[in-house]
Interface confidence: low
């Protein structure tokens, strides 16, 4: 058993049929010694008396808010949560496996630039009685500070008959050096509590590996005379690191017909313009990627050929 926060404790259980569970001793936070009784949750049934209560925690029915009283007055609370370990593996029931970029990916993180600011998000089908707490650092043995805000519900999606909820959090490295080579990874730790179930999820990454620029901005077409060719031009996104001479992007320009089965024409360039042939009913899209490190491409910025 360990303390998650004040008056909240996590009991780690091996979860299998007829498991013995864990013996837990609760101590009433009071100078009183006599006349103390204990109850669980809203029940008035007295579980025991005395300054300490010893319980065998085996299942969720044994978890919850334990309260010690004296003469009708509440003295203190201890909330017990369960963390299940099945076949030697901690449970991951609360979050959905996003399966990208690989299986068992519960947390995904992206950064728009090298400023040390990044966003992480996760998915769940659970809509109520759910709380998240996020901590982060650079490195784990001698951690350097990363400040994370509160996790918030950022999107709701319907998949078939089911709802999927996306939560996200923004974090900022306290002393980021955008041009420095990273040697220690960022560690992100999410504590998730659903009702009386506790789980924790972690992710470890270098900022350079989670870079995903915003789409190029100000995408424009300039038709060339007597030709179906057009000159496409665009600019670096405002959120990208500066100076652009050092933090350079490369771009992919795509001409896409109305039908997804039509052949795509693609051009790669380090410039902020390109000449392409506009097909009927086609659109032109441009996306960006760090020029010197193959992290994620941005989303597409698009404009219709017409």
């Amino acid at each position: 058993i360990w303390e998650l926060k004040k008056d909240v404790y996590v009991v780690e259980l091996d979860w299998y049929p007829d498991a013995p569970g864990e013996m837990v001793v609760l101590t009433c936070d009071t100078p009183e010694e006599d006349g103390i009784t204990w109850t669980l949750d809203q029940s008035s049934e007295v579980l025991g008396s005395g300054k300490t209560l010893t319980i065998q925690v085996k299942e969720f029915g044994d978890a919850g808010q334990y309260t010690c009283h004296k003469g009708g007055e509440v003295l203190s609370h201890s909330l017990l949560l369960l963390h299940k370990k099945e076949d030697g593996i901690w449970s991951t029931d609360i979050l959905k496996d996003q399966k990208e970029p690989k299986n068992k990916t519960f947390l995904r993180c992206e950064a728009k630039n090298y400023s040390g600011r990044f966003t992480c998000w996760w998915l769940t089908t659970i809509s109520t009685d759910l709380t998240f707490s996020v901590k982060s650092s650079r490195g784990s043995s001698d951690p350097q500070g990363v400040t994370c805000g509160a996790a918030t519900l950022s999107a709701e999606r319907v998949r078939g008959d089911n709802k999927e909820y996306e939560y996200s959090v923004e974090c900022q490295e306290d002393s980021a050096c955008p041009a420095a080579e990273e040697s220690l990874p960022i560690e992100v730790m999410v504590d998730a509590v659903h009702k009386l179930k506790y789980e924790n999820y972690t992710s470890s990454f270098f900022i350079r590996d989670i870079i995903k620029p915003d789409p190029p901005k100000n995408l424009q077409l300039k038709p060339l005379k007597n030709s179906r060719q057009v000159e496409v031009s665009w600019e670096y996104p405002d959120t990208w690191s500066t100076p652009h001479s050092y933090f350079s992007l490369t771009f992919c320009v795509q001409v896409q017909g109305k039908s997804k089965r039509e052949k795509k024409d693609r051009v790669f360039t380090d410039k902020t313009s390109a000449t392409v042939i506009c097909r009927k009913n086609a659109s032109i899209s441009v996306r960006a990627q760090d020029r010197y490190y193959s992290s994620s491409w941005s989303e597409w910025a698009s404009v219709p050929c017409s």
Epitope: D97, G160, D161, K260
Partner: antibody
Framework: EVQLVESGGGLVQPGGSLRLSCTVS????????MNWVRQAPGKGLEWVGA???????AYANWAKGRFTISRDNSKNTLYLQLNSLRAEDTAVYYC????????????????WGQGTLVTVSS | DIQLTQSPSFLSASVGDRVTITCQSS????????LSWYQQKPGKAPKLLIY???TLASGVPSRFSGSGSGTEFTLTISSLQPEDFATYYC???????????FGGGTKVEIK
């Protein structure tokens, strides 16, 4: 060991009904998406429908209205109710588990049951 | 309805041959990679070979590989073995769960 065992197949007259069962062991229905797939004699595989780990269902367009998927977690059993049966519903019916815990409907299927034959004939 | 078209439908090949089967979807599969491949032998249930377009399922020989993204996918057997003569199916998952569908199958026969 993970196992899926279908039952309930047999001969039924056109217009009749049948309920197929798929009894599972080694995992919990509440954490896996379960699928029904059928295969007419000498034909290819055809997805019938699925029930997600959280109880939501989806059906192939041709199966909507006639076929119903349900489950009983306490009995570790998945069901497929077949109504208004036609000769063209004659097939081996397989149940198959989603490959991952909490998989999307349409994700990989593994493992599969051995199948149960439904014959619709007068 | 979405069409998953496998080609060829029949394929005659010899042991040691490199075999390629394609699966084309009329719509992009979910997340560009929600496509799996199965092997089925007569009288048996299908067996998962490849999931997420290119990931080899556990216990499947490395001569099997999958590739592709979006709407075009390929199953390759680098060197056909006697036990590989079977029928192969692709399965696609889509934004709309009800569009889940199998390809028509490819029967690989001994030449």
């Amino acid at each position: 060991e993970v196992q899926l065992v279908e039952s309930g197949g047999g001969l039924v007259q056109p217009g009749g009904s049948l309920r197929l069962s798929c009894t599972v062991s080694g995992f919990s229905l509440s954490t896996y998406t379960m699928n029904w797939v059928r295969q007419a004699p000498g034909k290819g595989l055809e997805w019938v429908g699925a029930i997600s780990y959280d109880g939501g269902t989806a059906y192939a367009n041709w199966a909507k209205g006639r076929f119903t998927i349900s489950r009983d977690n306490s009995k570790n059993t998945l069901y497929l109710q077949l109504n208004s049966l036609r000769a063209e519903d004659t097939a081996v019916y397989y149940c198959a588990r989603g490959f991952y815990v909490y998989a999307y409907i349409g994700d990989a299927f593994d493992p599969w049951g051995q199948g149960t034959l439904v014959t619709v004939s007068s | 309805d979405i069409q998953l078209t496998q080609s060829p439908s029949f394929l005659s090949a010899s042991v040691g041959d490199r075999v390629t089967i394609t699966c084309q979807s009329s719509q992009t599969v979910y997340k560009n990679n929600l496509l799996s491949w199965y092997q089925q032998k007569p009288g048996k249930a299908p067996k998962l070979l490849i999931y997420l377009a290119s990931t080899l399922a556990s216990g499947v020989p490395s001569r099997f590989s999958g590739s592709g993204s979006g709407t075009e996918f390929t199953l390759t057997i680098s060197s056909l073995q006697p036990e590989d003569f079977a029928t192969y199916y692709c399965l696609g998952g889509y934004d709309d769960d009800a569009d889940t569908a199998f390809g028509g199958g490819t029967k690989v026969e001994i030449k």
